[in-house]
Each structure stands twice: as structure tokens, then as C-alpha cells.
């Protein structure tokens, strides 16, 4: 008896649906009381099908009311573990165990990633040196580095601080200044760039007509 | 309340058998993954075999692959362990454990354990 | 699978805070946070302390803590009191789904 994983890594986005496979041999019709399908994730338990059902009650609580396991594709000899709006907690080794007459056990790696595209941006300028002060903040995963360029494609150097975020997901919250003497309508790009993917996300940021004044920190009268 | 009662411990020579059982109560035992761990006398605890729910899946550690056949009785809330060609490093109290629901490792209740003595 | 290492013994008087160590891999303690405390008294079963690195089943003390950094994992026992004399054993899931546990550290309670 031997089961086959077509795939043995899944790269998927958070917030995403994944669904990975594991094949069993099936002679003519399935016997579902005789099917035993056990999904897990390293040390939780993911889901327990026996005796033709899902057993919920071992389920492990990171995993509730988002995975499942098809039942019209057991009968054609797939355990398909589907997991809807995964998380960056979701990524690890999954293992499915089949037994069915005989039993067998695959692994499967489940990688998330988060993309950085939503960049919010702010342009503010110092009146005492007319220095302005571009920022770029987005949230990913996983580090991305933030590279400043000017309209001819210079590159510029800025100032990164990463910091996890604080939302239960923990991504990412990289956030970039750059400092620089501009004028009105000057253009400059912010992309942040995860170096392992190659993957980048790019903001533009126009210098405006009015200066935007820059609150001082501890002013003193 | 959980309660796993092992029996069958003894002496016996090497090369001899021994069947383990481990009597469970207070908990759906068919819903827990189960297993066995020993401790060698003044030594640390060796995870020996786990066993899934259904009975059909099972592990065991490579000391005793081949030598040691972990099973179970849904129906009678009973868990086993036959153990084969034993040697005198199979001495160990042996604990019948129970897995944590949820995860696959983690053990939240044991056995009082029972003695198995090989020796000639 | 190697076990993983913890110091033979540890000692502190009733009222202080004593560390015991849990070193693994880069292949256990280090890859997941799933490492356990198990408390043994002499002749007895051992109990669950801590799970999943610093979670504490209901009914075990808020004395007992765990943490993990790296490839090292830690139980902190603070307030030492008598009844916390005994055998501490550490337990990592390892990436073959089976247990590997710890050497074993005595702890002792002085006075």
C-alpha cells in the first residue's frame, strides 16, 4: 500500500485558500468505514477522518472551521486537505497518513508567504532646514528590504526599522524614511523587496506643491 | 478522571516475550492517540511506540523496531504492547501514555508504569 | 535520536528561583515550539508541567514557567518550595513525529 503526494511543497499568500493532496489506491469502490486519513502539522493535529467521518473533537483549535476534507474526493482515492484563509502560522510539514488495508504516511511543506502591497506613504518637510522627509510602511512577510529611488533611477539612501506587528498574524511592519532636499513635484519611489522571492511592490511619491510642515518634536517657547 | 492502569510486567530471560496491557479509563479512549515509554532503572524516559486512534497507524523507535508490536481494543479500552526477542537493555518500568488532544506527541497523562526485568 | 541535555542537577533554597536548561538541535528544540516539562517524583509517574514551550495545563502552579531561545529551551521554577524537589525531564517533538526527551535534571530543595 503507498500513497503519492503529487506536490511536496505549496507555496501559497496569506490570507489565501490552499488544498494539498494525497493519493491512495482504490480498487473499484471505496470502502469508507475502512478508510482511516490523518492530516497533521508537525505536532497539532489537523483533521481525523474514521469510520466514514470527520472526528472534530482531536481537531487542534489553530485549525477549527478552516480545514477540511472532501468528501466526494476520498472516493476517488484523494485525501485532500483543504485550508481556507491561511495563515503565517499555517506554514510547516504536514503529514498525511493513510490507512486502508495497508498504511502509509507522506510529507508535504506548506510555505506562506504575505506580499508587501499595500504601501502606505507620507511626505512631511522641516521648516528649519526645508529637509523633507518621505516614509514608506507596509506589512508582509517575509523581510523585505525598502530601496529609495529618485526619478532618474538613482538610488538613494534611506533609513529602515522593521518591527513585528501586533496583530495576532505577526507580519511584518517595515517601515522606511528617507531624508532628502526636494522641491515641488520631484518624484521618488519607495520598493520594498523580498529578497528571497524577488518579489517587490513599489510606491511613488510626488513632492507637492505646498510644503507639507513637519511638526517639531519638543519645541520650546 | 483519566486513569491508565498497566499489567503484565515481569521477569523474563532473554530472547523470551511478554505481553503488556494498559486498562484506560475516564476519557474516549478511541479518540486518543496512545503510546508506550520506558525508563531503564536510574536512567531517563525513551519514547518506545505510539499508536493513532484507529489502530492502523503506528511508530515505533528504532531500539525496538521489529521486536516490539503496539495495538489496541477500541472496544474493550485497551491498550498493548507484545514484546518479542527481548534483551537485558529492555529492562524499564513501562509507561502507558496518553496523548493530549489536539497534538501528536505531547503527553498529558501516564500510568503508574509496570517492571520488566530480562535477565537470565 | 539523541537525548537532548540538561544539567544533572540543580539546587535552590525554598523561596528563590532556580533555571533548568533543555539543549537540543537545530532539528528539534530549535525548529519548533513544541517543547514539554514533565515533573517525576521518586518512584512515581511523571506529570505534565509545561506544553508547546510555556503553556501550563490547568491545576499546575503559575510557578512554573517555560520559556525557549534558539536551540535551548528553559523551566523556571520561582518561589522554590519543598514539594518541588524531584526528577525534571524536557520533551521535543522531533520533525519524525516521535518524542525525544530530555537527560533528566534533579532538583533539590535545600534547608
Known amino acids: 500500500f503507498t500513497i503519492t503526494a503529487p506536490k511536496d511543497l505549496y507555496v501559497v499568500e496569506y490570507g489565501s485558500n490552499v488544498t494539498m493532496e494525497c493519493r491512495f489506491p482504490v480498487e473499484q469502490k471505496l470502502d469508507l468505514l475502512a478508510l482511516v486519513v490523518y492530516w497533521e502539522k508537525e505536532d497539532k493535529e489537523v483533521i481525523q477522518f474514521v469510520e466514514g467521518e470527520e472526528d472534530l473533537k482531536p481537531q487542534h483549535s489553530s485549525f477549527r472551521g478552516r480545514a477540511f476534507l472532501p468528501k466526494d474526493q476520498l472516493l476517488k482515492g484523494n485525501a485532500v486537505l483543504q485550508i481556507t484563509d491561511v495563515k503565517l502560522q499555517d506554514a510547516g510539514v504536514y503529514c498525511c497518513m493513510i490507512s486502508y488495508g495497508g498504511a502509509d504516511y507522506k510529507r508535504i511543506t506548506l510555505k506562506v508567504n504575505a506580499p508587501y502591497r499595500k504601501i502606505n506613504q507620507r511626505i512631511s518637510m522641516d521648516p528649519a532646514t526645508s529637509e523633507h522627509e518621505l516614509m514608506c510602511q507596509a506589512e508582509g512577510y517575509p523581510e523585505a528590504e525598502v530601496i529609495w529611488t529618485n526619478s532618474d533611477h538613482q538610488s538613494l539612501s534611506g533609513e529602515t526599522t522593521v518591527t513585528t506587528s501586533q496583530t495576532e498574524e505577526k507580519l511584518l511592519n517595515v517601515t522606511s524614511v528617507l531624508r532628502v532636499n526636494a522641491t515641488a513635484n520631484d518624484v521618488f519611489h519607495c520598493t520594498f523587496w523580498r529578497v528571497h522571492s524577488g518579489e517587490n511592490h513599489t510606491a511613488e511619491l510626488i513632492i507637492p506643491e505646498l510644503p507639507v510642515p513637519r511638526l517639531p518634536h519638543n519645541r520650546t517657547h | 478522571e483519566v486513569q491508565l492502569l498497566e499489567s503484565g510486567g515481569g521477569l523474563v530471560q532473554p530472547g523470551g516475550s511478554l505481553r503488556l496491557s494498559c486498562a484506560a479509563s475516564?476519557?474516549?479512549?478511541?479518540?486518543?492517540?496512545m503510546v508506550w515509554v520506558r525508563q531503564a532503572p536510574g536512567k531517563g524516559l525513551e519514547w518506545v511506540s505510539s499508536?493513532?486512534?484507529?489502530?492502523?497507524?503506528?511508530f515505533y523507535a528504532d531500539s525496538v523496531k521489529g521486536r516490539f508490536t503496539i495495538s489496541r481494543d477500541n472496544s474493550k479500552n485497551t491498550l498493548y504492547l507484545q514484546m518479542n526477542s527481548l534483551r537485558a537493555e529492555d529492562t524499564a518500568i513501562y509507561y502507558c501514555?496518553?496523548?493530549?488532544?489536539?497534538?501528536?506527541?505531547?503527553?498529558?497523562?501516564w500510568g503508574q508504569g509496570t517492571l520488566v526485568t530480562v535477565s537470565s | 535520536q539523541s537525548a537532548l541535555t540538561q544539567p544533572a542537577s540543580v539546587s535552590g533554597s525554598p523561596g528563590q528561583s532556580i533555571t533548568i536548561s533543555c539543549t537540543g538541535t537545530?532539528?528539534?528544540?530549535?525548529?519548533?515550539?513544541?517543547v514539554s516539562w514533565y515533573q517525576q517524583h521518586p518512584g512515581k509517574a511523571p506529570k505534565l508541567m509545561i506544553y508547546?514551550?510555556?503553556n501550563r495545563p490547568s491545576g499546575v502552579s503559575n510557578r512554573f514557567s517555560g520559556s525557549k531561545s534558539g536551540n535551548t529551551a528553559s523551566l523556571t521554577i520561582s518561589g522554590l518550595q519543598a514539594e518541588d524537589e524531584a526528577d525534571y525531564y524536557c520533551?521535543?517533538?522531533?520533525?519524525?513525529?516521535?518524542?525525544?526527551f530530555g537527560t533528566g535534571t534533579k532538583v533539590t530543595v535545600l534547608g
Open positions: 508547546d514551550v510555556s
Open positions: 501514555a496518553r496523548i493530549k488532544l489536539g497534538t501528536v506527541t505531547t503527553v498529558d497523562y
Open positions: 499508536i493513532y486512534p484507529s489502530g492502523g497507524i503506528t
Open positions: 520533551s521535543s517533538y522531533t520533525s519524525s513525529s516521535t518524542r525525544v
Open positions: 475516564g476519557f474516549t479512549f478511541s479518540s486518543y492517540l
Open positions: 537545530s532539528s528539534d528544540v530549535g525548529a519548533y515550539n513544541y
